[in-house]
Interface confidence: medium
């Protein structure tokens, strides 16, 4: 009987609209024995990998991505995927980043994100594309 | 492409596995196969789904209330067991994949559908 | 819950005339939407997606647009042959398949 791996989660702290040149911090989640989280953007070949892989509860570990000085060029959509030997997840809901231009807090609490997908190991065409799991090879556009 | 069988005429309260083959396309590739339905003179109604990859996740809408079952099997067949039907449940099945990228969740294949008549 | 509300419930086209198709959200969908032409007795046909991406096959008359929560199908130079029931689809909240159909608009051509 094969393990059904639960999908991940995506948030942002502290929150989805970032005012331009502050901090956001992307938080994946998912179950604990991961190896590997990545941060997708949105772009079939921008994505961001990390091993570095915390236990924020007994049953969930979680990681976290800092862009420090938000640029315009960072809104957009993300989602989260992660590895768990030995497979790959499915992958999270969509969180939309909006960078608004003046100073100041955010003024948008998180948006409740949305829909999920699962990464394609040999995608069918090119307006379909996923990009594969990293250990199919591919290689990596940092997301900052 | 896809194609559905298993539509029948049933009475309420029978059950019912409706079948989807697939072909030209590998589940390796890690679509979601979703069952759509549609009541006559109505609107499309999103059934449940089920992810093709290694996991096997499985979506239902919430009006399903336990009453279906989507699985898989390896040879690119998904098949939705229906339990406990009412008339209600007659519509046209359509068995379809939905791609899940960046541009969002669509349904780009469809089935030419199968009928599912409960009456008694 | 995300939910489409899809207007007029039908309309009347001339033929080389233009309809005109909306679809609103309850929230913002980042533009994942999805459109389907089913013509009676047949099975859905995808029109467009991620808003304004036309589908490989698909005529040019037939356009998307919008952003946010709202969202347009234009058909231009309407045809006998477009004659059909068209829903959009929000392709945001995937696997949370409530709702995820607008009602559908049914085009006849007069």
């Known amino acids: 009987q094969e393990e059904d791996l639960p999908r991940p989660s995506i948030s942002a702290e502290p929150g989805t609209v970032i005012p331009l040149g502050s901090h956001v911090t992307f938080v994946c989640r998912g179950p604990v024995g991961v190896q590997t989280f990545r941060l997708e953007r949105d772009s079939r070949s921008t994505y961001n990998d990390t091993e570095d892989v915390s236990q924020a509860s007994p049953s969930e570990s979680e990681a976290r991505f800092r862009i420090d000085s938000v640029r315009e060029g960072n809104a957009g959509l993300y989602r989260c995927i992660y590895y768990k030997p030995p497979k790959w997840s499915e992958q999270s809901d969509y969180l939309e980043l909006l960078v608004k231009e003046s100073s100041g807090g955010p003024d948008s609490p998180d948006t409740e994100p949305g829909s999920s997908a699962g990464p394609t190991q040999r995608p069918s065409d090119n307006s379909h594309n996923e990009h594969a799991p990293a250990s199919q090879g591919l290689k990596a556009e940092h997301l900052y | 492409s896809v194609k559905e069988s298993g539509g029948d005429l049933v009475k309420p309260e029978g059950s019912l596995t409706l079948t989807c083959k697939a072909s030209?396309?590998?589940?390796?590739?890690?679509?979601?196969m979703c069952w759509v339905r549609q009541a006559p003179g109505k609107g499309l109604e999103w059934i449940a789904c089920?992810?093709?990859?290694?996991?096997?996740?499985t979506y239902y809408a919430s009006w399903v209330n336990g009453r279906f079952t989507i699985s898989k099997t390896p040879s690119t067949t998904v098949t939705l067991q229906m339990t406990s039907l009412t008339v209600a449940d007659t519509a046209t099945y359509f068995c379809?994949?939905?791609?899940?990228?960046?541009?969002?969740?669509?349904?780009?294949?469809w089935g030419p559908g199968t009928l599912v008549t409960i009456s008694s | 819950e995300l939910v489409l509300t899809q207007t007029p419930a039908s309309v009347e086209a001339a033929v080389g005339g233009t309809v005109t198709i909306n679809c609103q959200a309850s929230?913002?969908?980042?533009?994942?939407l999805a459109w389907y032409q089913q013509k009676p007795g047949q099975r859905p046909k995808l029109l467009i997606y991620?808003?304004?991406t036309l589908a490989s096959g698909v005529s040019s008359r037939f356009k998307g647009s919008g952003s946010g929560t709202e969202y347009t199908l234009t058909i231009s130079g309407v045809q006998c042959d477009d004659a059909a029931t068209y829903y959009c689809?929000?392709?945001?909240?995937?696997?949370?398949?409530?709702?995820?159909f607008g009602g559908g608009t049914e085009v006849e051509i007069k």
């Open positions: 379809s994949r939905k791609l899940t990228n960046f541009n969002g969740a669509y349904l780009d294949l």
């Open positions: 089920i992810y093709t990859g290694s996991t096997s996740g």
């Open positions: 929230q913002s969908i980042s533009n994942l």
């Open positions: 689809q929000q392709g945001y909240t995937s696997n949370n398949v409530d709702n995820a």
């Open positions: 030209g396309f590998s589940f390796s590739n890690s679509y979601y």
């Open positions: 991620r808003a304004s």
